[in-house]
């Protein structure tokens, strides 16, 4: 964590309500906020939403936003007809800019965009756009929801009536009606090119208070293809001061965004303040909890035929959505634990988001090496109450790889879980190779609280012509004080430990799409011991084959096209960044060199998802690997882990057998299913598809070991 003492215990950088009128005024505006003592607030912790009311009394009102919209409780309002948009089809000018406010990323609109209709009292002018998102892999990040369904991102466009006020800020300060549109972004398999200028801009405002001009974009293209189906209700700002002055228009249809593009949101940093200490953290989960509807009524538009779609709901969206193709996000919290010398237990937790509930069963795929060939076996785990399975007859000198897939009622599969590596000759579980850069040197290994997500790039082992992509498993990342996933750390190179890249390790993970066809041999792996390899701990962005797999972004993301970035001089932040840059440039050059060297000899890995084809690009990464929040720490004081023996291919290996916990006898109704089964259903889905985001507290995270019942063989 980057700590530094500040002189203002109640700062409000990023206080969204007062985004400046022009770039030139920005530093003045920021200082004015500090001086005026506007209340500091955050999305969690001591200044979190439950405490907003102490400094912003309106936050405790009865007409607050956001809300969950229940479609069947919404009445059709005849007054809610077609929206009239004016200027939305024009390209934005080069004066339009984006700012990382510390609480959101805001686009300050400098062109004339007007909206009327939809029951709005007049012709309203768009002032700014703000975004709210989750923590990773398409997790719920929207503020509003429909039928309990939340989306990865919510974009909000704010409007004021220029006939009544000379500025948006005046309307807010005088507690007068403003308008807001909420647009959901839903995960799609492919990039949405309309978002490119936004994503590009995000890379230029990675750090708090950064600002950048945006490439031209068309605002209409950021809205759903069909605007006819929307909800209307009266609510509030979703951030302090929570003024109850907002006429909300919530579009029913989402806009597509790829996992690759989502990564740009997850890579944004903020500064959090605790007492007199500031820390730099990821800006994630920047959504307000939902508020009670109380006596309000939600209405829905009366636009003819807008709601009469069924399976054709997304046919006007050429990109489709990821939820149409997969059962759920991947199973999470993958763990492998030895039960005894010849048996392993694989356990996991329910996926966080289930697009097509319920999950009926899980498919466990595991593979091992024998004579340089990889054997793979898949079996179905029927019980959805007991999320673990036992693999018996494991050979102690083999390397095993495990992954799990959920299967929904409609036979769709989830994406694969993280791939776990296990070397059964040791019970030590490798937690991943990470070196965390903090403000002060640390002698001890990084604690789980310091594990930082690093969201770009993977590196490829190349030995004897065998490509072997390695991504370390992210574990133990609980929410930080800001509600983000982890504190900040830099991508650093490290010498991987002996053997296959982990000394004394048992577990790591592969990117889901890079299920290697062969593993490195013992000699090949040991040759690699001195190589530097980038460890990444999060879902990778999904570059196409033409994109270099090594991270190319420095701490400021400047080479990503940060244009005319405004200098910042507040609170010594700048000076600190310069130090960072120096060390990171050096690390980056080493890392890039290493990865480039690897890439020269590494062919694109074969995609293994049932929903991806080689034609879609060999380096695509299926989203959804999540951090293992529950893996036990195994570095006990005084405990020295033995090194892994080199991999030995023995001719006497016995293929392991899978045991479903508590089962006896095989199930004739469940033939083994191939893990690469093609999709059996159409890839479209109803926009109203009910999908469930599981409360983590309800998940089965049991780590208890239970003996397999005898004789269950697949």
């Amino acid at each position: 964590v980057l700590h530094y003492v500040v002189c203002f215990p109640a700062l409000t950088e990023g206080y969204v309500g007062t985004l400046q009128e022009s770039r030139q005024d920005s530093s003045v505006q920021i200082r004015r906020r500090k001086a005026s003592g506007d209340p500091y607030w955050a999305y969690s912790g001591a200044y979190g939403p439950e405490h907003w009311v102490t400094s912003s009394v309106s936050c405790g009102g009865s007409h607050q936003s956001p809300i969950d919209i229940l479609d069947h409780h919404a009445r059709v309002g005849d007054e809610y007809q077609e929206l009239q948009l004016d200027g939305f089809d024009n390209e934005s000018s080069n004066k339009t800019w984006m700012k990382n406010t510390g609480k959101t990323v805001a686009i300050l609109l400098k062109d004339d965009y007007f909206v009327s209709g939809a029951g709005l009292p007049g012709r309203f002018k768009a002032e700014k756009v703000e975004f709210h998102w989750g923590h990773s892999n398409g997790s719920a990040g929207s503020e509003h929801s429909v039928n309990g369904r939340r989306f990865p991102v919510e974009m909000q466009i704010f409007f004021y009536n220029p006939d009544d006020f000379d500025s948006f800020q005046t309307a807010i300060s005088e507690n007068r009606i403003i308008g807001a549109m909420a647009i959901f972004f839903q995960v799609s398999p492919r990039d949405n090119s309309a978002l490119d200028p936004i994503i590009h801009g995000l890379k230029g405002v990675v750090h708090h208070e950064k600002e950048t001009f945006l490439d031209p974009f068309i605002l209409r293209d950021l809205l759903p293809a069909s605007l006819g189906s929307y909800y209307r209700y009266t609510g509030s700002l979703t951030t302090p001061p929570c003024s109850e002055i907002v006429e909300w228009i919530v579009f029913r249809r989402p806009v597509p965004i790829s996992y690759h593009q989502l990564e740009a949101f997850y890579s944004i940093f903020t500064t959090e303040q605790q007492d007199h200490v500031k820390s730099v953290e990821y800006l994630r989960n920047n959504f307000r909890p939902q508020q009670a509807l109380n006596d309000r009524v939600v209405s829905k538009s009366a636009v003819r035929d807008a709601w009469n779609h069924d399976l054709a709901d997304f046919l006007d969206n050429p990109l489709g959505t990821e939820a149409s193709k997969v059962c759920s996000s991947p199973p999470i919290h993958m763990k492998v634990q030895p039960l005894n010398q010849t048996a392993l237990q694989v356990s996991w937790s329910q996926p966080e988001t289930i697009y097509h509930p319920p999950i009926m069963n899980y498919m466990i795929s595991y593979s091992w090496t024998k004579n340089e060939d990889e054997k793979e076996k898949t079996f179905t785990k029927d019980s959805d109450k007991d999320l673990k399975a036992t693999i018996s007859h494991v050979s102690p000198d083999s390397l095993y790889l495990f992954r799990v897939q959920a299967v929904c009622r409609n036979d769709m599969r989830s994406d694969f879980s993280q791939t776990m590596l296990f070397q059964a000759n040791t019970t030590r579980i490798f937690q991943g190779t990470r070196i965390v850069k903090t403000g002060v040197p640390t002698a001890s290994p990084a604690s789980s609280a310091d594990m930082a997500p690093i969201s770009s790039g993977s590196s490829t082992w190349t030995s004897s012509g065998i490509p072997f992509s390695f991504v370390s498993m992210a574990t133990g990342m609980g929410p930080s004080s800001s509600g983000s996933q982890a504190t900040v750390a830099s991508v650093v190179t490290s010498t991987l430990l002996a053997g296959l890249g982990f000394g004394g390790g048992g577990i790591s993970s592969f990117p889901s799409t890079v299920w290697p066809t062969r593993l490195p041999t013992a000699s090949a792996a040991s040759k690699q011991a001195g190589r530097t390899v980038l460890a990444t701990t999060e879902a990778l962005a999904s570059p196409g084959p033409d994109v270099h797999s090594a991270p190319s972004k420095d701490s400021e993301g400047t080479e990503e096209g940060e244009k005319e970035e405004k200098s910042e001089s507040e609170d010594g932040e700048r000076e600190h960044e310069e130090e960072e840059k120096d060390s990171e440039k050096k690390e980056k050059s080493e890392a890039t060199h290493t990865a480039a060297e690897s890439d020269r000899t590494a062919p694109a890995p074969t995609p293994s998802s049932p929903h991806r084809t080689a034609a879609e690009g060999g380096h695509q990464t299926i989203p959804g690997r999540r951090q293992d929040h529950s893996a036990p720490a195994t570095d006990q004081p005084g405990h020295v882990a033995p090194d892994l023996d080199p991999l030995v291919d023995t001719a006497t290996q016995v293929p392991p057998t899978a045991t479903e916990e508590h089962y006896s006898g095989s199930d004739p109704r469940r033939p083994e299913m191939p893990s690469k089964k093609p999709m059996s259903r159409g890839d479209r889905f109803s926009e109203d598809s009910k999908f469930i985001t599981v409360n983590p507290a309800e998940k089965n995270t049991s780590g208890m070991l239970s003996r397999p019942s005898p004789g269950r063989m697949e």
Partner: antibody, heavy 120, light 111 residues
Amino acid sequence: QEQQKESGGGLFKPTDTLTLTCTVSGFSLSSNAISWVRQAPGNGLEWIGAIDNSGSAYYATWAKGRSTITRATNLNTVTLKMTSVTAADTATYFCAREDVRADSIDLNMWGPGTLVTISS
Amino acid sequence: SFVLTQPASVQVNLGQTVSLTCTADTLSRSYASWYQQKPGQAPVLLIYRDTSRPSGVPDRFSGSSSGNTATLTISGAQAGDEADYYCATSDGSGSSYQFVFGGGTQLTVTG
């Protein structure tokens, strides 16, 4: 108020095609699944099939081939069509709304049922 | 196919506690639900996900599950509890998906 009601019951002849309709109100078929269940006089409940919120249909093993479940979301109706009926199909037919959770399904709201009698 | 077995009838004295069982021919793969049906009426959901009670269902009704047996327990049985009770669970996916009911138990409350 959320509810559903079956219609289309009555007297049918063997080999007829039975068409029953479940009309729902207060909730959307786009975000809810419906199951059809029947109960022969003096017997237990027997699941016939279901249609989920995305329009996919599922059938009991015995009902496959001669049962079809469809829906019209804009009309708020789900239809069960059963061909080649016999006296054994005499029963009260219920439609029930499914409560679909992450890892389980139950039938949390039932219509009053419609009686179907098959007799020559 | 997947079968759920319930005793055909069970008697309980007024005010006493009774347990109705539902046994799967293989270990229960999914969560069980329980339904109460009174003569001439549609069934009503009593218990879902093995142990959870929908709002409006008295807390005299409780569910549990162990191994391949799900159990519905009615404590302090009342005359109004006299009804048929069905357990159910779901199984399979895709074309093999099934929702299965047990044969039902007729509960008689005496005294």
